[in-house]
């Protein structure tokens, strides 16, 4: 019932109303896919083909750029290996992370020879420094893929880089790595499809488990081929994987391999009329909404269907308590390749595989000290039996009757007159952004979704591949192959010139101030502010 947006704005309308600023790319670049938002410096760093950009958050028309191509020799070698000179034999930036107060760490495909370096950004924004450390290049293997078509998820914390990527030229050896730092690289098990089975990595996040930093975990979100016997026929499953930050590998069979890696399936489905659920299995993007308690962010996931016949998209929400419950549940087990997966019923060794070595949960100091039976069990039981179900057991947004699919999501928590609301900005594969508000009904997790706006942000239809939201600037930044776009989070004046129209819009950012539909600020002591997000009832709120 809420499938029709309150506002539908074409690219032309967005331009004419000054609601979009676009950087249409450089002639010798493309693939503006890798975003790093720095609210403190008021910069958006963007990794692209042969370039890294530093955009001003106020106006992306104001930018600096670093040109980082590959040598002619490297490009020729790539061409001789049978690769496409334009689409593959260049340096596509795949990793762009804050390294410390003064430097970024960047990695690119390097024309099928991954390479990394540091970028100096200075101590203060006013330093206006943005330059490549030309003297310090590093091997990018296990950090960036060789192939620009492959997805990478990375996270840099305490000088260590966690990456989910392909570590070989052919793009077959997928792994979750930890590199940089002073330790030997650590990775997931090789040649074992039970650990990873042709994964497509989406994102990586550090989430605390307790007040003790020893318990911190890194969570990877990815999709992968379902393991034989887990599903009849070839299927994709969405996954959440966990690794302890203080995992330094085991001994014997897991030397320099993760000992705490576990993964679970993320379910995002709707019941079908015939009793068979329709699954949205192709995880496309993830956003973590941190609010109040950093240990328990709400996970927003964007999913699409695997089927070519039935095309659909959905957004599902997950709670970290549900995720942790699954990781504390039964492990998936099978006795041989032709057997079904069952919950493991035997004795689970102590300390329980997947537990971080710390004073909180166990009496052992390092993963290198784990007993043999723990190592053996961990190696052969990386998957959990139970999946993680979404909050309320169903998606909060579903789109099945449209000619596009969801690709990206960012979420903003907005204070309104009648409470707090999560506003989702959903990117699509045709270059549009949907602005959707979740409105709680009886309980906060039983939600109604209202489609507020549908905006076309690029001149030509192009898949949105990156999105960042600046709460400070109240702006949204969008990346695609073609370029970068910037738009405000709200366009209150466009809702109309009357109180009723403003109220009916149900946009948490907007309220009637007595004379116009304008930005709502909860701190403003204005008795005339009219807004009703929960019910959108103008009769009660618009007395005039």
């Amino acid at each position: 019932k809420n499938n029709v947006p309150r506002l539908k704005l074409s690219y032309k309308e967005m331009l004419e109303s000054n609601n979009v600023i676009t950087f249409n790319g450089l002639a010798n670049s493309s693939s503006y896919h890798t975003f790093l938002l720095d609210e403190e410096r008021s910069r958006l760093y963007v990794g692209a083909k042969d370039h890294i950009f530093s955009f001003d958050l106020v106006n992306i028309k104001d930018f600096q750029k670093i040109v980082w191509p590959v040598s002619y020799t490297r490009r020729d070698e790539c061409k001789w290996a049978g690769k496409d000179i334009l689409k593959e034999c260049a340096n596509f930036i795949k990793v762009l992370k804050a390294y410390n107060q003064t430097h970024l760490y960047a990695c690119g495909t390097g024309a099928f020879h991954p390479i990394c370096t540091y970028i100096e950004i200075g101590h203060h924004p006013e330093d206006n420094i943005f330059k490549l450390e030309n003297s310090h290049f590093e091997n990018g293997r296990g950090k960036s893929p060789y192939d620009p078509k492959l997805l990478t998820a990375s996270l840099l914390i305490d000088g260590e880089l966690y990456s989910g990527t392909a570590a070989d030229f052919m793009g077959r050896d997928f792994a979750i790595f930890r590199t940089l730092g002073h330790h030997h690289p650590i990775r997931t098990e090789q040649h074992d499809s039970r650990w990873l089975n042709d994964p497509k990595f989406i994102s990586a996040h550090l989430i605390s488990e307790s007040d003790n930093p020893e318990d911190d975990k890194v969570y990877f979100f990815f999709r992968e081929n379902a393991i034989d016997g887990e599903h009849s026929g070839k299927a994709t499953h969405a996954r959440i994987g966990q690794i302890c930050k203080n995992d330094f590998g085991g001994h014997r069979s897991l030397v320099n391999k993760w000992t705490t890696f576990l993964k679970a399936r993320l379910i995002c489905s709707v019941p079908g009329p015939n009793g068979i659920d329709t699954h949205f299995d192709e995880l496309q993007d993830v956003f973590l909404m941190n609010f109040k308690d950093p240990k328990n962010p709400v996970v927003y996931g964007v999913f699409t269907t695997s089927s070519n016949i039935f095309k659909g998209s959905a957004v599902c929400m997950y709670s970290m308590s549900d995720v942790r419950r699954v990781f504390l549940g039964p492990y998936a087990h099978r006795d041989g390749p032709n057997y079904q997966w069952v919950p493991y019923q035997g004795r689970v060794p102590y300390p329980r595989p997947g537990t971080c070595p710390s004073k909180t949960f166990g009496g052992f100091d390092s993963t290198k000290d784990l007993p043999d039976d723990v190592i053996t069990f961990a190696r052969s039981h990386p998957a959990m039996y139970n999946p993680v179900f979404p909050m309320n057991n169903r998606p909060i947004v579903i789109k099945t009757d449209v000619n596009y699919q969801f690709t990206q999501i960012v979420v903003d928590r907005v204070d309104a007159e009648d409470g707090q609301y999560d506003v989702m900005f959903i990117g699509t594969d045709v270059g549009t952004v949907l602005k959707v508000v979740s409105i709680p009904k009886e309980t906060w997790y039983d939600l109604e979704e209202v489609l507020l706006e549908e905006m076309t942000v690029f001149r030509e239809p192009t898949a949105i591949s990156a999105m960042e939201l600046s709460t400070k600037q109240q702006q949204l930044y969008i990346g695609s192959t073609a370029g970068v776009a910037q738009l405000p989070l709200h366009r209150c004046d466009i809702y109309g010139k009357a109180c009723a129209e403003c109220c009916l819009a149900r946009d948490p950012y907007c309220a009637w101030d007595g004379s116009a539909c304008s930005r709502y600020f909860p701190t403003a002591k204005r008795a005339t502010r009219a807004q009703d997000i929960r019910n959108g009832d103008p009769l009660t709120h618009c007395s005039d």
């Epitope: 070698e77 020879h113 293997r141 296990g142 060789y146 070989d168 690289p185 090789q190 040649h191 069979s253």
Partner: antibody
């Protein structure tokens, strides 16, 4: 001390079959990936086949694909190579080798080798 | 023909320094993969001599050293001794087909 001992080689006619075995000792066999590498008389080394610790990954060189089958029995600490439809060009010393993965990038090396068993394919 | 190219033979007098080259391509050594070296003494099985481009397993004398640059690698032997006379093979990951590749081997002859 790590030891790998191959057996099962011998003279066989073209089109015939042989089964090689490699008995491992001195290390935790079920922790390691294992391989067969061959060396034709007077020639260089050629990787033939590899198998992961739990047999979840198996791979072959194109020259033997469809004819050779690698397997392992972890309870017996033994690696096998079943060779069918043998050809004259399969004549070689067959070595059993353990993957060490000693380097930083986990690129396979062969840190221990058996003494080899000679397979001769001739009519 | 081997995927990795090595000179068929090298020679040197005792005490001298010799190097053996190993040239690959952008899909093996040039892809950033590690190179390993093996020594095969006459009538024996190969033995791991250098792993990960430049590391020596315990028991290998420091007269043996390895290096890698671009699509090539090299093995250097200093203070050549009579017992170094052997065949030397380089090896790299290629994945997945074939999984690993070897050089054609280099016969080292110690003169005199």
């Amino acid at each position: 001390e790590v030891q790998l001992l191959e057996s099962g080689g011998g003279l066989v006619q073209p089109g015939g079959s042989l089964r090689l075995s490699c008995a491992a000792s001195g290390f935790t066999f079920d922790s390691y990936e294992m391989n067969w590498v061959r060396q034709a008389p007077g020639k260089g080394l050629e990787w033939v086949s590899g198998i992961s610790w739990n047999s979840g990954w198996i791979d072959y060189a194109d020259s033997v694909k469809g004819r050779f089958t690698i397997s392992r029995d972890n309870s017996k600490n033994t690696l096998y190579l079943q060779m069918n439809s043998l050809r004259a060009e399969d004549t070689a010393v067959y070595y059993c080798a353990r993957s060490g993965y000693s380097s930083s990038w986990f690129d396979p090396d062969f840190d221990y080798w058996g003494q080899g068993t000679l397979v001769t394919v001739s009519s | 023909q081997s995927v990795l190219t090595q000179p068929p033979s090298v020679s040197g007098a005792p005490g001298q320094r010799v190097t053996i080259s190993c040239t690959g391509s952008s899909s093996n050594i040039g892809a950033g993969y590690d190179v390993h070296w093996y020594q095969q003494l006459p009538g024996t099985a190969p033995k791991l001599l250098i792993y990960g481009n430049s590391n020596r397993p315990s028991g290998v004398p420091d007269r043996f050293s390895g290096s890698k640059s671009g699509t090539s690698a090299s093995l250097a032997i200093t203070g050549l001794q009579a017992e170094d006379e052997a065949d030397y093979y380089c090896q790299s990951y290629a994945g997945p087909n074939p999984y690993v590749v070897f050089g054609g081997g280099t016969k080292l002859t110690v003169l005199g």
